[in-house]
């Protein structure tokens, strides 16, 4: 039986040309982690395999940065980067896991409402 | 002055497929996500998911997948969302409702389109 | 999912009055930057859902300052403080943190 939960940075509005970090946590489970993949719209951006470590997709790897942990950092944002992300954790014995962020990227001139741009 | 302008009530039988349009005006189409909300008759609200029609991209309610799919028409600067396999739970009000840039809420919506599924 | 409770479900009140509709999440509505994104909507019978409050205690253009947003973490709360006829409909709370967004089950706010 599958106990376990995902639980993500969050939402997370930012910045064109801002950098942000997506981080899920797997809790409530004993089952292994064997690899996280993370994925946007049925792309894939980067792997952290138990065994082998990172693999960020070649298309991805000039803005994509691993870590912390098994999270991930994308950098020099662009509004084409607004959408949905997945963390996918595949886990032994249980199966896979799979987590939901929502990244908006904004334009600058959004500033004038007020929004508070998450640049770390 | 920002609008979302809805199609009119549909009456439609069980098993058909159906889309809804949201003409958007008053702003740029393609700089806000735009959201889909249900309210059925016991009023509650839900939200069915959203796309972003700079790039299509979407997110949905996983309870909404392959019950409604959401697409957007940039030359004309419309959303529809069409919904699918209809059965009477289908029943509702659907709402467009724009995005509010920075802060994951919804500013301006559509006037609602009455669905109606009955044999 | 996000759970979102609201309370009360009915809220009988006098014109003039002073009320205060609260919204429970289920988990923590704050990201990790620290940014929390809950708002509250007016739907009047017969109109659209209106935005009302954002990011917890904004008032969206043209929002009257008799509606006023407070709260953190799971527990939030829409405070009106001299009830209007224009005031009267369903509100809700709406978590947008989390996927997917969810709303509260409404509050009726009707005259006694």
């Known amino acids: 039986m599958m106990t376990g939960t995902i639980e993500t940075t969050g939402n997370i509005s930012a910045e064109k040309g801002g950098s942000i970090i997506l981080q899920c946590h797997l809790s409530s489970t004993t089952a292994q982690v064997t690899q996280v993949n993370w994925e946007q719209q049925d792309q894939l951006l980067a792997i952290c395999n138990a065994d082998l470590g990172w693999h960020i997709s070649p298309s991805f790897k000039d803005r994509v940065a691993p870590g912390p942990g098994l999270g991930l950092t994308l950098q020099s944002l662009t509004v084409n980067d607004t959408g949905e992300y997945f963390c996918i954790y595949h886990t032994y014995p249980d199966g896979t896991y799979t987590g939901r962020i929502f990244l908006e990227v904004l334009e600058s001139s959004v500033a004038e409402h007020g929004a508070r741009f998450q640049i770390p | 002055e920002v609008q979302l302008q809805q199609s009119g009530p549909e009456l439609v039988k069980p098993g058909a497929s159906m889309k809804i349009s949201c003409k958007a005006s008053?702003?740029?189409?393609?700089?806000?996500?735009m959201n889909w909300v249900k309210q059925s008759h016991e009023k509650n609200l839900e939200w069915i998911g959203l796309?972003?029609?700079?790039?299509?991209?979407?997110s949905y309610n996983q309870k909404f997948k392959g019950k409604a799919t959401l697409t957007v028409d940039k030359s004309s600067s419309t959303a529809y969302m069409e919904l699918l396999s209809l059965t009477s739970e289908d029943s509702a009000v659907y709402y467009c409702a724009r995005g509010f840039r920075g802060y994951f809420a919804m500013d301006y919506w559509g006037q609602g389109t009455s669905v109606t599924v009955s044999s | 999912d996000v759970v979102v409770t609201q309370t009360p479900l009915s809220l009988p009140v006098s014109f003039g009055d002073q009320v205060s509709i609260s919204c429970r999440s289920s988990q923590s509505l704050a990201n990790s930057y620290g940014n929390t994104y809950l708002s509250w909507y007016l739907h009047k019978p017969g109109q659209s859902p209106q935005l009302l409050i954002y990011?917890?205690?904004n008032r969206f253009s043209g929002v009257p300052d008799r509606f006023s947003g407070s709260g953190s973490g799971t527990d939030f709360t829409l405070k009106i403080s001299t009830i209007k006829p224009e005031d009267l409909g369903m509100y809700y709370c709406l978590q947008g943190t989390h996927q997917p967004w969810t709303f509260g089950g409404g509050t009726k706010l009707e005259i006694k």
């Open positions: 796309i972003n029609p700079y790039n299509g991209g979407t």
């Open positions: 990011g917890i205690s």
């Open positions: 008053g702003y740029s189409f393609t700089g806000n996500i």
